[in-house]
């Protein structure tokens, strides 16, 4: 099969600090040296890019300085962390993997991870 399969967890619950982590794993049909990983958010049939990073196989994954994402790569597996999440950011986060080089190019799109974010309750005033 010429397509690339991408696997990611169906559901993840963000921490009380608004941090969610999940693994995006792809079955590479070719020997890529350059890979691009993009996290997309799908809400109400609208798709937006959350963050993206291109990395050379064997090297570290680097997102832009102002990105809300961080990640590490190991073989065909990428560990993604999204921070600064709030309840309104709850939604489906799709992992998109592109084998950019060498040719041929391959595209792989995961089914998405539903990330649930619950805003922490404000701390009650205390008399300490």
């Amino acid at each position: 099969c010429k397509a690339m399969h991408v696997a990611q967890p169906a559901v993840v619950l963000a921490s009380s600090r608004g941090i969610a982590s999940f693994v995006c794993e792809y079955a590479s049909p070719g020997k890529a040296t350059e890979v691009r990983v993009t996290v997309l958010r799908q809400a109400d049939s609208q798709v937006t890019e959350v963050c993206a990073a291109t990395y050379m196989m064997g090297n570290e994954l680097t997102f832009l300085d102002d990105s809300i994402c961080t990640g590490t790569s190991s073989g065909n597996q990428v560990n993604l962390t999204i921070q600064g999440l709030r309840a309104m950011d709850t939604g489906l986060y799709i992992c998109k993997v592109e084998l950019m080089y060498p040719p041929p190019y391959y595209l792989g799109i995961g089914n998405g991870t539903q990330i649930y974010v619950i805003d922490p309750e404000p701390c009650p005033d205390s008399d300490f």
Partner: antibody
Framework: QVQLVESGGGVVQPGRSLRLSCTAS????????MDWVRQAPGKGLEWVAV????????YYADSVKGRFTISGDSSKNTLYLQMNSLRAEDTAVYYC???????????WGQGTLVTVSS | EIVLTQSPGTLSLSPGERATLSCRAS???????LAWYQQKPGQAPRLLIY???SRATGIPDRFSGSGSGTDCTLAISRLEPEDFAVYYC?????????FGQGTKVEIK
């Protein structure tokens, strides 16, 4: 809203060159793959070339490899197709198209006609 | 290169009828990376379906896509006058991107 406007088409003799432009607006150019697709008169669609993101990666159809060069200027939000050594079979309407985030070409320009004839 | 073959070449139907268009790939290609386009004379193509079954923004629900393995289908449940056009399938899972030769849906 997203808009793609091509220009630069015209009549050119075989062996000569032409440069097409596609001005994009309404989106961040560097977040998408940008493609050229052509359609010969009365025929179907044929993908020509793609340029991705930072512009380092470019792929071409075998039919144009070595003759056509795709490039982009993100500061001007403009896509280019430099066509050299043109042949009669390159006669077509050339469309620029945006690669959708989840695949497919989600926006297309109106097209520009290139006629290669002596 | 993945070759896409569309059938039939021409489909003659009346408004209100159902249209079923087929797209077959020369080799196993995930239907997740297949798109359908509509093109009217003198106009640019318009994306209808991506990922084999997801409707693009603004596309009415009378258009639906399905498929698995090497076969994909575009269905138009009730043809409206504006649906008479040429339809193309395209695969975008691996380079080079390829299109089918098109199916013309004409008024009977």
């Amino acid at each position: 809203q997203v808009q793609l406007v091509e220009s630069g088409g015209g009549v050119v003799q075989p062996g000569r060159s032409l440069r097409l432009s596609c001005t994009a607006s309404g989106f961040t150019f560097s977040s998408y793959g940008m493609d050229w697709v052509r359609q010969a008169p009365g025929k179907g669609l044929e993908w020509v070339a793609v340029i991705w993101y930072d512009g380092r990666n470019k792929y071409y159809a075998d039919s144009v490899k070595g003759r056509f060069t795709i490039s982009g200027d993100s500061s001007k939000n403009t896509l280019y197709l430099q066509m050299n050594s043109l042949r009669a079979e390159d006669t077509a309407v050339y469309y620029c198209a945006r690669g959708g985030l989840l695949g497919g070409f989600d926006y297309w320009g109106q097209g520009t006609l290139v006629t290669v004839s002596s | 290169e993945i070759v896409l073959t569309q059938s039939p070449g021409t489909l003659s139907l009346s408004p209100g009828e159902r249209a079923t268009l087929s797209c077959r790939a020369s080799q196993s290609v995930s239907s997740s990376y297949l798109a359908w386009y509509q093109q009217k004379p003198g106009q640019a193509p318009r994306l209808l379906i991506y990922g084999a079954s997801s409707r693009a923004t603004g596309i009415p629900d009378r258009f639906s896509g399905s498929g698995s393995g090497t076969d994909c289908t575009l269905a138009i449940s009730r043809l409206e006058p504006e649906d008479f056009a040429v339809y193309y399938c395209q695969q975008y899972g691996s380079s080079p991107w390829t299109f089918g030769q098109g199916t013309k849906v004409e008024i009977k």
